[in-house]
Interface confidence: low
């Protein structure tokens, strides 16, 4: 099956790469604008220059295009703990990231939040913290993993999942409680 092409894609495919079809005259192919610029006026005729203008401050185009307006620069989401890695330029959007020893938790494709990497206190690092994933910890004996922290088995209640991991400790406590009862 041939994928359905949008009108703009259909029009562009008639012209060689790096050119687009004139919207008012389909016999003319105009040269696309370089990244960092946008289309101000279509080329007047074959072999004539397209009128491209540089993006204004606060806007950009990251690839060759025939957009009538530049795209607005993204703003890093401070409430998500994001920091600016590199500023927006006419040909590149703002790059946002997290601070050192933090990872990105993606709420959706484009929205991430920064969280501290787990330190694995009372445990060891099984997998190091990565850009998009928290540290994976393995806990020492007598500790169990809760909310990515190694917690003492003395905090393990019988109703919780940790009973499997803290089985010897739980049995000891149970034995003490049961002594002297029928």
């Amino acid at each position: 099956l041939v994928p359905h092409l949008g009108d703009r894609e259909k029009r562009d495919s008639v012209c060689p790469q790096g050119k687009y079809i004139h919207p008012q005259n389909n016999s003319i192919c105009c040269t696309k604008c370089h990244k960092g610029t946008y289309l101000y006026n279509d080329c007047p005729g074959p072999g004539q220059d397209t009128d491209c203008r540089e993006c204004e401050s606060g806007s950009f185009t990251a690839s060759e295009n025939h957009l009538r307006h530049c795209l607005s620069c993204s703003k890093c989401r401070k409430e998500m703990g994001q920091v600016e890695i590199s500023s927006c330029t006419v040909d590149r959007d703002t790059v946002c990231g997290c601070r050192k020893n933090q990872y990105r938790h993606y709420w959706s494709e484009n929205l991430f939040q920064c969280f501290n990497c787990s330190l694995c206190l009372n445990g060891t690092v099984h997998l190091s913290c990565q850009e998009k994933q928290n540290t994976v910890c393995t806990c020492h004996a007598g500790f169990f993993l809760r909310e990515n922290e190694c917690v003492s088995c003395s905090n393990c209640k019988k109703s919780l999942e940790c009973t499997k991991l803290c089985l010897p400790q739980i049995e000891n406590v149970k034995g003490t409680e049961d002594s002297g009862t029928t």
Epitope: F115, N116, S118, N134, E147, E149
Partner: nanobody, 119 residues
Framework: EVQLLESGGGLVQPGGSLRLSCAAS????????MGWVRQAPGKGLEWVSQ????????YYAHSVKGRFTISRDNSKNTLYLQMNSLRAEDTAVYYC????????????WGQGTLVTVSS
């Protein structure tokens, strides 16, 4: 034991309003930021809103900004989400959550309340 109990969901027409509540217990409510997240049918979790422990800072997803208002009453240990100008795309199960911001996004969740926006 930490408990979060959401209420206030239901069926509403597009353009209508709902107010969700989340009654919290088992922890010191005033110490923590709280948040709302939602899950539309067959989709992943979407962050909706967040409020600081003292309610002086509120944050919203672009999709709900200007329509939803998050608030809290620390004397009642209750979190609220006022939802106005509801749209079909707001249909989801809404979860209230404690926002510790330590290692993971949310440590504790409620059971959720279903909001259906349909004519």
């Amino acid at each position: 034991e930490v408990q979060l109990l959401e209420s206030g969901g239901g069926l509403v027409q597009p353009g209508g309003s709902l107010r969700l509540s989340c009654a919290a217990s088992g922890f010191t409510f005033v110490k923590y930021s709280m948040g709302w997240v939602r899950q539309a049918p067959g989709k992943g979790l979407e962050w909706v809103s967040q409020i600081s422990n003292t309610a002086d800072r509120t944050y919203y997803a672009h999709s709900v900004k200007g329509r939803f208002t998050i608030s809290r009453d620390n004397s009642k240990n209750t979190l609220y989400l006022q939802m106005n100008s509801l749209r079909a795309e707001d249909t989801a199960v809404y979860y209230c959550a404690i926002y510790t911001g330590r290692w993971e996004p949310f440590n504790y969740w409620g059971q959720g309340t279903l909001v259906t926006v349909s004519s």
